[in-house]
């Protein structure tokens, strides 16, 4: 999902030395930067949550805001500390003048300063409810674990918790954070309050509608009557659900966010400490027919991030909006017209759709999953997610075009059976953000801290690009895609997958001398190929043609253009092997691929050769897709005939484990 | 531990008014409503309706309306039931249980209706 | 409404005995159906929720089955304590009903 270097607005205000002794410079005389919410509507002028550097204890935070209150008040500026963050991010939200801020920015600890801004709860339309009539009851659903060792916790509006399809499944907490309803006239009808919150706790765990029917759940306060929330808030009930964990230990934990604002860092930022912390996150994409990484906490790569669709697996339209897309997404799920309970009455059953319902639905099938197996880990709860949807049902023309590729094709579904997938070798396709369109542009494309990467891919539709590799970034290796001169710019795709006990390197080959191409291969003793990569510094590697097919008795073997430098990823780990598939097509053709067969994970997709015609290749479930120029402007040369390459791997180790425990 | 504790038993004339209370302990008020449940004497049980601890909601059975009120007072935890224009056949004990899930019930309040 | 039958209205037998009681819903009920246990002068006690599953602390000589409109309760060895009156009730729709009760005795 969405890099460091998001879509947001930022602005970094420049550290001068006219300041007046009252502040310490920055640690290393780096800059903090203040970020604001892109959509002007959403943002919250004069309320700021100032973000300390990772290691800053409490005590330095309370002085920092003391001591920015104090320079505050010598300039004649009242300032209020509305809260100090601890446990989950260290820094405080404070109520000040914009004029205090380039102040604040040169405070000791600031790593940077972000304003408040609004989230909103994404159901349409959640508070004028069609009401079904209150005998109605969903088609019988009897999961075989209901999620019963599993706790989710809502933030949203608040709910009515003795409701029958949720009472005694919910506790309401004491945590309540939202801002003033909008408007003079604005009259707080309890039912209304409830409506949004009601419906979601209905649908994850309602004894009759619910996806999780023994799931207990916790809600804070979020969002108020009118749906509506700040960033600030939802920092705030994250924080207090850390705190809870570290107070009480229990199982494994859900928090769902049916909201979402503008891009914000910090949600982000918090998402993630949550998310390392051992908690599964799950948010709506959002309700604005636009790209998910635009906003928050749907742009957070350590949350799951929901898209919604129909009863016919096509996106929902909303109005004049709908569900969001894009990289950000990790898969869709039901979210319309999705019957729940209703606060008109304690028996009352009401249809909402939007992708709170969405992403409620998958927080009741991540309730199951954990339930049947508590120790997943977020990774593997994702892949496996992603590996039980249901592939290639969703209808893409009504994503715009350039979405098309980077929205994934997945509607949500329960497993077969809720143990025994743990044999598979599960990957997933990561896509980075767009580069850019500047010569030296690059784009990254990260697996998450547990996963391994296995294998990398480009892809530009102008066709102008210059490869990707694999490069160790952090001590973790990352997907590099770059761009080439006059090349609109490019996406780096990573195949991320749960190897267990893997040890994988990058075996590299620099550009050939002869002109039978380059070559690469994993020599190691042990070590398998699970992915090709090419990158060149030429603009244009022109029509030279390597020998597609690898010698005989050679599979774990890479070969590319000889003006590109070759890059085989090379892993060992209990168990695991793998082979090659090729499909060539000896006339143009804008796409060719080639799948694993049953039993046979996709780790690695690239294409053959790495001319200039070719748009890039990438991974589609199990399928390897390279993409070229149209065909009308390629003509039919012998330039034309590209060979998509797949590696599948399996894992013996992973089945003779499965095996054992069953 | 989760408990209802009712009022103790009533004897009322025909024509009059009867209100049982039932206390909540034990366990989060207003994750539960309570439902009344009475039985005549030698007879089955019949449920009466239901209120919410959470907002003060009720749904009363068909049989009910309009002789019954059900109230609560959410800072002491109490639950009430008022029964106006009582009859012979209103004789009952009649019992308080949580939720719709009626898995925890009060001890019964005996109420007799005679001339 | 619906309506909860349940068969036989009352049955003896020794201590050590299988006994089964069964409730017939009016119509399908799906498995929201309830069995309380009650003695004399006391409240109702919750014995079996949905159909099925043992509420907690009830011996596991009691026992649910059924769904849609027929239900078993059963008693798999009939204990002195167990002598009372059972009641099925459904929990799938408003108003919730009862069964006439079934009235276990000492033979």
């Known amino acids: 999902q969405e890099d460091e270097d998001g879509d947001y607005e930022e602005l970094v205000l420049a550290l001068r030395s006219e300041e007046d002794g009252l502040a310490e410079a920055p640690e290393h005389g780096t800059t903090a930067t203040f970020h604001r919410c892109a959509k002007d509507p959403w943002r919250l002028p004069g309320t700021y949550v100032v973000v300390l550097k990772e290691e800053t204890h409490l005590s330095q935070s309370e002085r920092t805001a003391r001591r920015l209150q104090a320079q505050a008040a010598r300039r004649g500026y009242l300032t209020k500390i509305l809260h100090v963050f601890h446990g989950l991010l260290p820094g405080f939200l404070v109520k000040m003048s914009g004029d205090l801020l380039e102040l604040a920015l040169k405070l000791p600890h600031v790593d940077y300063i972000e304003e408040d801004s609004s989230v909103f709860a994404q159901s349409i339309p959640w508070n004028l409810e069609r009401i079904t009539p209150p005998r109605y009851r969903a088609d019988e659903y009897q999961p075989p674990d209901g999620g019963s060792l599993v706790e989710v916790y809502l933030l949203d509006t608040s709910i009515q918790s003795d409701h029958r399809e949720i009472e005694g499944r919910v506790m309401v907490t004491d945590f309540e954070n939202v801002p003033e309803e909008d408007g003079t006239r604005f009259h707080r009808q309890a039912s209304k309050c409830d409506s949004h919150g009601t419906h979601l706790a209905g649908v994850v765990s309602g004894r009759d509608a619910g996806v999780a029917k023994g799931a207990s759940m916790r809600s804070l306060r979020v969002l108020n009557c009118q749906g509506k929330g700040t960033v600030s808030g939802t920092l705030i009930g994250l924080e207090f659900i850390r705190k809870s964990q570290l107070v009480q230990p229990v199982g494994p934990l859900v928090v769902l966010l049916p909201l979402a604002g503008g891009y914000s860092r910090v949600l982000n930022a918090a998402c993630q400490r949550l998310a390392r912390a051992g908690v599964v996150l799950v948010t709506a994409a959002g309700n604005f027919r636009d790209d998910a990484c635009l906003y928050s906490p749907a742009s957070a790569p350590e949350v799951i991030t929901v898209g919604a669709t129909n009863a016919q697996d096509q996106p929902v339209t909303l109005g004049t909006l709908g569900t969001n897309f894009g990289r950000c997404v990790d898969l869709f799920a039901p979210g319309e017209d999705i019957i729940g309970a209703s606060s008109d009455c304690s028996t009352c059953f009401v249809s909402q759709s939007g992708t709170s319902q969405a992403a409620a639905h998958v927080a009741g099938i991540a309730a199951m999953m954990l339930s049947a197996e508590p120790e997943l880990t977020l990774a593997e709860l994702r892949q496996r997610l992603i590996h039980f949807s249901a592939k290639d049902v969703i209808n893409e023309a009504w994503f715009p075009e350039d979405q098309r590729v980077l929205t994934p094709n997945l509607v949500a579904a329960l497993p077969p059976s809720t143990h025994g997938a743990g044999w598979q070798l599960f990957c997933r396709t990561v896509w980075s953000a767009h580069s850019g369109p500047t010569r030296m542009a690059t784009a990254v494309a990260r697996c998450a801290p547990d996963e391994e990467l296995l294998s990398c891919s480009s892809f530009s539709r102008s066709g102008k690009r210059r490869g990707e590799r694999m490069e160790a970034q952090g001590g973790k290796l990352v997907c590099r895609a770059h761009n080439a001169f006059g090349g609109e710019g490019v996406y780096a795709i990573a195949r991320c997958c749960l190897l267990p006990q893997a040890n994988c390197s990058v075996h590299t080959a620099p550009p050939a001398e002869a002109s039978m191409g380059t070559r690469v291969h994993c020599h190691q003793q042990g070590h398998v190929l699970t992915g090709c990569s090419s990158h060149w510094e030429v603009e244009d590697l022109g029509t030279h043609k390597p020998p597609v097919l690898r010698p005989r008795g050679q599979p774990n073997q890479c070969v590319g253009h000889r003006e590109a430098s070759i890059h085989a990823s090379c892993c060992h780990a209990p168990g695991l092997e793998c082979k090659v598939k090729e499909h060539g097509i000896p006339a143009p053709q804008e796409q060719v691929t080639v799948a694993c067969e049953e039993g046979w994970t996709l780790t690695g997709c690239s294409a053959l050769p790495g001319t200039s015609h070719v748009l890039g290749a990438y991974a589609v479930d199990n399928t390897c897709v390279v993409r070229s120029r149209d065909v009308s402007t390629t003509g039919s040369t012998s330039e034309g005939a590209v060979t998509a390459v797949a590696i599948c791997c399996r894992s013996r180790h992973l089945a003779q484990a499965s095996q054992e425990l069953q | 531990q989760v408990q209802l504790v009712q009022s103790g038993a009533e004897v009322k004339k025909p024509g009059a008014s009867v209100k049982v209370s039932c206390k909540a302990s034990g366990y989060t008020v207003t994750s539960y409503g309570i439902s009344w449940v009475r039985q005549a004497p030698g007879q089955g049980l019949e449920w009466m309706g239901w209120?919410?601890?959470?907002?003060?909601?009720?749904n009363y059975a068909q049989k009910l309306q309009g002789r019954g009120t059900m109230t609560t007072d959410p800072s002491t935890s109490t639950a009430y039931m008022e029964l106006r224009s009582l009859r012979s056949d209103d004789t009952a004990v009649y019992y308080c249980?949580?939720?719709?899930?009626?898995?925890?019930w009060g001890q019964g309040t005996t109420v007799t209706v005679s001339s | 409404d619906i309506q909860m039958t349940q068969s036989p209205s009352s049955l003896s037998a020794s201590v050590g005995d299988r006994v089964t009681i069964t409730c017939r819903a009016s119509?399908?009920?799906?498995?929201?159906l309830d069995w309380y246990q009650q003695k004399p002068g006391k409240a109702p006690k919750l014995l079996i929720y949905?159909?099925?599953t043992l509420e907690s602390g009830v011996p596991s000589r009691f026992s649910g089955s059924g769904s849609g409109t027929d239900f078993t309760l059963t008693i798999s060895s009939l204990q002195p304590e167990d002598f009372a009156t059972y009641y099925c009730q459904q929990d799938n729709d408003i108003p919730l009903t009862f069964g006439q009760g079934t009235k276990v005795e000492i033979k």
């Open positions: 249980a949580r939720g719709y899930s009626l898995d925890v």
């Open positions: 209120l919410s601890f959470y907002n003060g909601n009720t």
């Open positions: 949905g159909a099925s």
């Open positions: 119509q399908s009920v799906r498995n929201w």
